[in-house]
């Protein structure tokens, strides 16, 4: 490990927010990746333990991929015997840090995503206020979640084939966690924000979606002004 001579110090996690999912339950035959992004000076080394013992490729059929540049452990086509606690140990001469992940391998039938009943819920908001729509997704397979807003094109809500016109407001990306995708936040709403919103969840089996409506009311001052204008 190289020592640059500046800011020498013990290892630390560079992306702790990416490490908060400590229990991973995945269907058999899927690929699993554990990451422990870290830094330190000198650059720390990373090693992996399974159930507290050194973990090497020959310990499992299909082997493992250790990507030191990405601080990751990859296991393809997981089987029930891969269940257990996986610990990354990151160390340099100034110290050592570790993180343990628990892997559960599921053998039940994967299904299309199940969305919690009643979510997202219809909302009524005052002009200029903030609104949150929630969507709770249950899926054996990794779901791909999108938030859509239904829009009109040339006065029509649907295309020639009957497909609704939608615009994607939020979708899975490199910097978006599953938790973040379960909430759609609208700030300082305008009358244009009123309409139908859809939470769409897909996996390798299929899609499921739930919709909700946002009604935007004028602010109270506007209501008062309207009343005064209408008085004799």
């Amino acid at each position: 490990a190289e020592d640059t001579g500046v800011d020498t110090g013990a290892p630390y996690w560079t992306r702790p927010e990416r490490m908060d999912k400590k229990l991973l339950a995945v269907p058999a035959a899927n690929t699993v990746r554990f990451r422990c992004p870290a830094a330190g000076n000198p650059t720390p080394s990373i090693s992996w333990l399974k159930n507290g013992r050194e973990f090497r490729g020959e310990h499992r059929i299909g082997g493992i991929k250790l990507r030191h540049q990405q601080w990751s452990l990859v296991m393809e086509s997981v089987v029930p015997s891969d269940r257990g606690n996986y610990t990354c140990v990151v160390e340099n001469k100034f110290g050592s840090i570790r993180q343990t992940y628990t892997l559960d391998v599921l053998e039940r039938s994967p299904h299309r995503p199940i969305l919690q009943a009643g979510l997202p819920a219809n909302q009524t908001a005052v002009l200029g206020s903030d609104v949150e729509f929630h969507c709770k997704v249950y899926s054996d397979a990794q779901p791909h979640i999108q938030w859509l807003k239904h829009v009109e094109v040339n006065g029509s809500k649907v295309g020639p084939d009957g497909t609704p016109y939608v615009t994607v407001l939020k979708t899975a990306g490199a910097n978006t966690t599953d938790k973040e995708l379960e909430v759609l936040s609208l700030h300082n709403v305008t009358f244009e924000d009123a309409g139908e919103y859809t939470c769409l969840a897909g996996n390798s089996i299929g899609f499921s979606h739930h919709s909700a409506w946002l009604v935007v009311l004028p602010a109270e001052e506007e209501l008062v002004e309207a009343d005064e204008a209408g008085s004799v």
Partner: antibody, heavy 124, light 112 residues
Amino acid sequence: EVQLLESGGGVVQPGRSLRLSCAASGFTFSSYAMHWVRQAPGKGLEWVAVISYDGSNKYYADSVKGRFTISRDNSKNTLSLQMNSLRVEDTAIYYCVRGAGHGFPTGPDGFDIWGQGTMVTVSS
Amino acid sequence: DIVMTQTPLSLSVTPGQPASISCRSSRSLLHSDGKTYVYWYVQKSGQPPQLLIYELSNRFSGVPDRFSGSGSRTDFTLKISRVEAEDVGVYYCMQYVEAPLTFGGGTKVEIK
């Protein structure tokens, strides 16, 4: 035109291996899950396996689990099925089928486009 | 696994007459999003299956309106209002809720 074209079928002895391929065209292959379905001569349809759009999720029928491996190469618009330890009962026409895509489903969310199939015969 | 049971095994129909095929699932196919994920296919001799009906009752593009799907939860029906000679083939129902995806055993439709 949306098309799926299977290849790689043939006659093979029990215990041997075979690799099937499916070339996709006319749609954004990398946005769709893909399936294999088979049909034994004179019999009904049996689902074999599925792979997610990015290859990270794979599921198999119990009858092929541990013997067959589904994979994909999105850069080449190709789906594959590696079949090992073949048995006489694996004899069938193997169809490549388009699964669920990304985005708001326009009509059915998959299982709408089937290839013509490729015949696999396992016989001693 | 969800078992799909199809009846009858075969059907001989006079052209212009209606035909009905039943399919029963061992579990409800009504999903949390309110849709019922049963699909219907026809397979003509030497060809791959062709999609007719998706999500219980939606006709796939290009499918004649003499084909219709109905039912609820575990009992489903495919109806052909007036059978034509070109409708000959084997008809299959399929559940698209969970893996393994499963098909009915098929119903062979012939013309009298």
